[in-house]
Interface confidence: medium
Amino acid sequence: EAHKSEIAHRYNDLGEQHFKGLVLIAFSQYLQKCSYDEHAKLVQEVTDFAKTCVADESAANCDKSLHTLFGDKLCAIPNLRENYGELADCCTKQEPERNECFLQHKDDNPSLPPFERPEAEAMCTSFKENPTTFMGHYLHEVARRHPYFYAPELLYYAEQYNEILTQCCAEADKESCLTPKLDGVKEKALVSSVRQRMKCSSMQKFGERAFKAWAVARLSQTFPNADFAEITKLATDLTKVNKECCHGDLLECADDRAELAKYMCENQATISSKLQTCCDKPLLKKAHCLSEVEHDTMPADLPAIAADFVEDQEVCKNYAEAKDVFLGTFLYEYSRRHPDYSVSLLLRLAKKYEATLEKCCAEANPPACYGTVLAEFQPLVEEPKNLVKTNCDLYEKLGEYGFQNAILVRYTQKAPQVSTPTLVEAARNLGRVGTKCCTLPEDQRLPCVEDYLSAILNRVCLLHEKTPVSEHVTKCCSGSLVERRPCFSALTVDETYVPKEFKAETFTFHSDICTLPEKEKQIKKQTALAELVKHKPKATAEQLKTVMDDFAQFLDTCCKAADKDTCFSTEGPNLVTRCKDALA
């Protein structure tokens, strides 16, 4: 239904707290360099204006679109050109071009310092002094670093943050209460960020149809007892929600997500038997819970997939007369039978099925041609299964850090032109798949591994798009989203690469490394490892292990020495010489 004032409608639906949070996220995601105070001022102005529209929907400007209202606010910021350069040109455009322009200027890798967590005591003091401002800072800092973060989900993480602080700040040992809990939230939020970015990439590059196919597969796995019409309705609604969030329409997105959660809870009987626990929760927790609800039990009497999609004499007729519906039912039927497959794999199978029908239905004897299609799926299924087995075996053997190093070597060889910080970040993230997925039951490993890897590789592609340097990466990133992971896995050593010359300073370390937290130490060592591979792309695993063991021993010795500086300055050059010899 149409509302006289869109802003009043959203304010009423969402309530003041969520309204303000979402507006803050929106502004922080668009203008990533502005301070919290600058954004907080704008948010207050927008909220005050929304309240005047609630009081009188006919008041001046209340009938304007949200894009117009928000865009006008952003464009009124002083020194916009000085701080944001060509983004200021967006302000010369009219809606909807202006919003499109803002979206195009979102930076996936803004040059902002890492979000440092204050020490426990200081954090609790500022939280107690003003919880609202404290949570505002959290939303601002996360949103500006992750300009596509799923806004309603960020409100959920802020709520989690709030609950943890409320609980831990009342304890004697605040630090040991806060650290593991906040680390847990941070890890989940980072995974949520890359997953959502993947969804937005899918939407931006391949349109709503591609996202809807993803949603049909995912929802069919989770709700195998729901019929195709129900799954289609949920997929359509979910597509709308994600399109809005990816498009910066955060108020509409959060509102529609709440509506979708409400619909699911009111229609549990036709969707899934597993929803009740989620539906008993308050809004943000409910929507989050529904998004990762466990798979319903599969119906026991499902007929073989071949009956409708291979053996039926009407296959070509059904495909020709309603292509998207027929392929949609295939994806639905296959996915509900395979919660053990990744969504990426299911989409590859649907694509293979479509290509087979395209080819076979044009031939003299279609059934004879497409009769073997299910057997032709086998290699497509085996490839990711082998990937999971090989990588989980390696993870179990090496542990997370060692596994990250193995991936770092592999990916530096595949794309040595990529910057070392990007390679290290990617390898560390890809390496976490072990801890995240390899410990799961067998039937959950494949979907966990492949869909997580796909999301991480999407980030690699986004960063590479900014400054393309590797033909290998460009090739894999140019294809369809579901083919990316197999493409990257299939890459081998880049034979066109001219090795980097050996620079002693790259491998020169100082005593300050000793006081770094363990994570930072690892990053330093991994940076050195990537540089070694760039110097000797064809070094054997044994050679690299020798050098890295020597390096670890050197750090251990010098960091324990009474005179660390002298140790580093005398032993360092010896280490560099030994490295060169080992790799010669």
Epitope: E358, A362, E363
Partner: nanobody, 116 residues
Framework: EVQLLESGGGLVQPGGSLRLSCAAS????????MGWVRQAPGKGLEWVST????????YYADSVKGRFTISRDNSKDTLYLQMNSLRAEDTAVYYC?????????WGQGTLVTVSS
């Protein structure tokens, strides 16, 4: 280079008939399924009909079933669409396309206007 050239469109009264032709070149015609797609003014593309490579199998959208007939002459590399009992809602640009349903090449289109 693949080329598809439609002809036969024009203005016709409701209940009337038209025959569209499509001359194909630049690919092996008798190895490929062919089809017709249309776009009414201000609307999206709508699939109309498909014929298999050898002409043995034909498929139609519900909206045209029983009124339209697709055929081909592989010796002339030509595709046809016979349209009978035309209605106002059949007014559209008709495109000849190569493929079964996932068409990879299209012609420029021919306009069919059904009006009294």
């Amino acid at each position: 280079e693949v080329q598809l050239l439609e002809s036969g469109g024009g203005l016709v009264q409701p209940g009337g008939s038209l025959r569209l032709s499509c001359a194909a070149s630049g690919f092996t015609f008798d190895n490929n399924a062919m089809g017709w797609v249309r776009q009414a003014p201000g609307k999206g593309l709508e699939w109309v009909s498909t014929i298999s490579a050898n002409g043995n199998a034909t498929y139609y959208a519900d909206s045209v079933k029983g009124r339209f007939t697709i055929s081909r002459d592989n010796s002339k590399d030509t595709l046809y669409l016979q349209m009978n009992s035309l209605r106002a809602e059949d007014t559209a640009v008709y495109y000849c396309a190569k493929g079964f349903r996932r068409f990879d090449y299209w012609g420029q289109g021919t306009l069919v206007t059904v009006s009294s």
